[in-house]
């Protein structure tokens, strides 16, 4: 079995389409370099939402065009997914890889069900 | 064991604070008068949200000041709860009682987790 990864079962996106959750991994060693990937599961299909490698010293850095941002503290990663719409409601799985130094470990959480509700449009001002 | 009552596990309230779900009960007989109660569970506490008695011929009627409305068809009740705010997020249990004719039956569903997100206020029009 892989490394244990914990994440909340359910999260509600804000009315602005932003959802945040903590992904925590259990590691016996001291990883200097960790890769975090957020996957969306639809049926048996998994699609990558975003990914980032961070070092324990540095801030978590996602790609500039990413829908995700994050911060890390020890073995906890605070993940924020932006730009969510109602059609993005689904199960979001946190995958953690301890990349360096060896040994390499990998673990996946059970997934966070993110619920997204599209806001009502504001009335036009006359 | 009580009468079987089925309801969905999860429902999202709309951005207007309206949540709808179906409560279905399994009855061997043909009840003429049925009472439906919606309860909100918080910890070990249960509070009544709304209740209505209906006859198979008539429409489901909640009190005028109720936060609930509903329609019935056979052994299915379509419940709608209005005016929900984020603080109302919680487990809503459907309780069904077959009041008349005897024998009296009662059953409770496992609850529907209703998630409510408060909308962002619309910008003031200048």
């Amino acid at each position: 079995k892989g490394m244990h990864v914990a994440q909340p079962a359910v999260v509600l996106a804000s009315s602005r389409g932003v959802a945040s959750f903590v992904c925590e991994y259990g590691s016996s060693g001291n990883a200097a370099e960790v890769r975090v990937t957020v996957l969306r599961q639809a049926g048996s299909q998994m699609t990558e939402v975003c990914a980032a490698t961070y070092t324990v010293e540095d801030e978590l850095a996602f790609l500039d065009d990413s829908t995700c941002t994050g911060t890390s503290s020890g073995n906890k990663v605070n993940l924020t997914i932006q730009g969510l719409r109602a059609m993005d409601t689904g199960l979001y799985i946190c995958k953690v890889e301890l990349m360096y130094p060896p040994p390499y470990y990998v673990g996946m959480g059970n997934g966070t069900q993110i619920y997204v509700i599209d806001p009502e449009p504001c009335p036009d001002s006359d | 064991k009580g009468m079987h009552v089925a309801q969905p596990a999860v429902v999202l309230a709309s951005s207007r604070g309206v949540a709808s779900f179906v409560c279905e009960y399994g009855s061997s007989g043909n009840a003429a008068e049925v009472r439906v109660t919606v309860l909100r569970q918080a910890g070990s506490q249960m509070t009544e949200v709304c209740a209505a008695t209906y006859t198979v011929e008539d429409e489901l009627a909640f009190l005028d000041d109720s936060t609930c409305t509903g329609t019935s068809s056979g052994n299915k009740v379509n419940l709608t709860i209005q005016g929900l705010r984020a603080m109302d997020t919680g487990l809503y249990i459907c309780k069904v009682e077959l009041m008349y004719p005897p024998p009296y039956y009662v059953g409770m569903g496992n609850g529907t987790q209703i998630y409510v997100i408060d909308p962002e206020p619309c910008p003031d029009s200048d």
């Epitope: 079995k1 370099e33 890769r35 490698t53 360096y100 060896p102 040994p103 470990y105 990998v106 996946m108 | -």
Partner: antibody, heavy 114, light 111 residues
Framework: EVQLVETGGDLVKPGGSLRLSCVAS????????MNWVRQAPEKGLQLVGG????????YYTDAVKGRFTISRDNAKNTVYLQMNSLRAEDTAVYYC???????WGQGTLVTVSS | QAVLNQPASVSGSLGQRVTISCTGS????????VAWYQQLPGTGPRTLIN???NRASGVPDRFSVSRSGNTATLTISGLQAEDEADYHC???????????FGSGTQLTILG
């Protein structure tokens, strides 16, 4: 498509030097630590060493410590293995691999012989 | 050089099932994961089974693994011609503080 292509393998005399390159494509190279692994003729695989994603930290197996140096140039998507004081027992096919072992290159042959 | 012990060769007929063992010690397989790699002639290794025991992307479910004590086993069921290759196991050795590999097993598909 992820690709790792090793080059630089050659025939070299004992005590000589050689630099191997591994060019990566198809993935975010700068986000991944990389490993070098070798396979001597008719032998199993052996870890040579590795380097972290930024290139600031390396590790080596005891057999090559002090003789081999791993470096990387993220702008060129390339990881290097500088081999000095080569010995006959360094003869092998050398592979680069992502540190999660998801992808390996096709290898480059280094022969150390007089 | 190889710390993990594998049989030099195994063989099986098309459609059959074969097993490849990988035996180590209490400092590697006994307390760490085991990964498996397939190596076709003239190519680099390809990961079959990741360190979490799951099949790598695109690997059919004919490949499965088990572990008992200090021995890991790769099982290939429903043998196909394209399975003819070398198979390597690896683990992390907590005493040597390095990855250790098996000597490799050559799988031959019979007529």
């Amino acid at each position: 498509e992820v690709q790792l292509v090793e080059t630089g393998g050659d025939l070299v005399k004992p005590g000589g030097s050689l630099r191997l390159s591994c060019v990566a494509s198809g993935f975010s190279f700068s986000s991944y630590a990389m490993n070098w692994v070798r396979q001597a003729p008719e032998k199993g695989l052996q870890l040579v060493g590795g380097i972290n994603s930024g290139g600031s930290s390396t590790y080596y197996t005891d057999a090559v410590k002090g003789r081999f140096t791993i470096s990387r140039d993220n702008a060129k998507n390339t990881v290097y293995l500088q081999m000095n004081s080569l010995r006959a027992e360094d003869t092998a096919v050398y592979y680069c691999a992502i540190s999660n072992w998801a992808y390996w290159g096709q290898g480059t042959l280094v022969t150390v012989s007089s | 050089q190889a710390v993990l012990n594998q049989p030099a060769s195994v063989s099986g007929s098309l459609g059959q099932r074969v097993t490849i063992s990988c035996t180590g010690s209490s400092s590697d397989i006994g307390k760490s994961y085991v990964a498996w790699y397939q190596q076709l002639p003239g190519t680099g290794p390809r990961t079959l089974i990741n360190v979490d025991g799951n099949r790598a992307s695109g690997v059919p479910d004919r490949f499965s693994v088990s572990r008992s004590g200090n021995t890991a086993t790769l099982t290939i069921s429903g043998l196909q011609a394209e399975d003819e290759a070398d198979y390597h196991c690896s683990s992390w050795d907590w005493s040597l503080h390095t990855y250790v590999f098996g000597s490799g097993t050559q799988l031959t598909i019979l007529g």
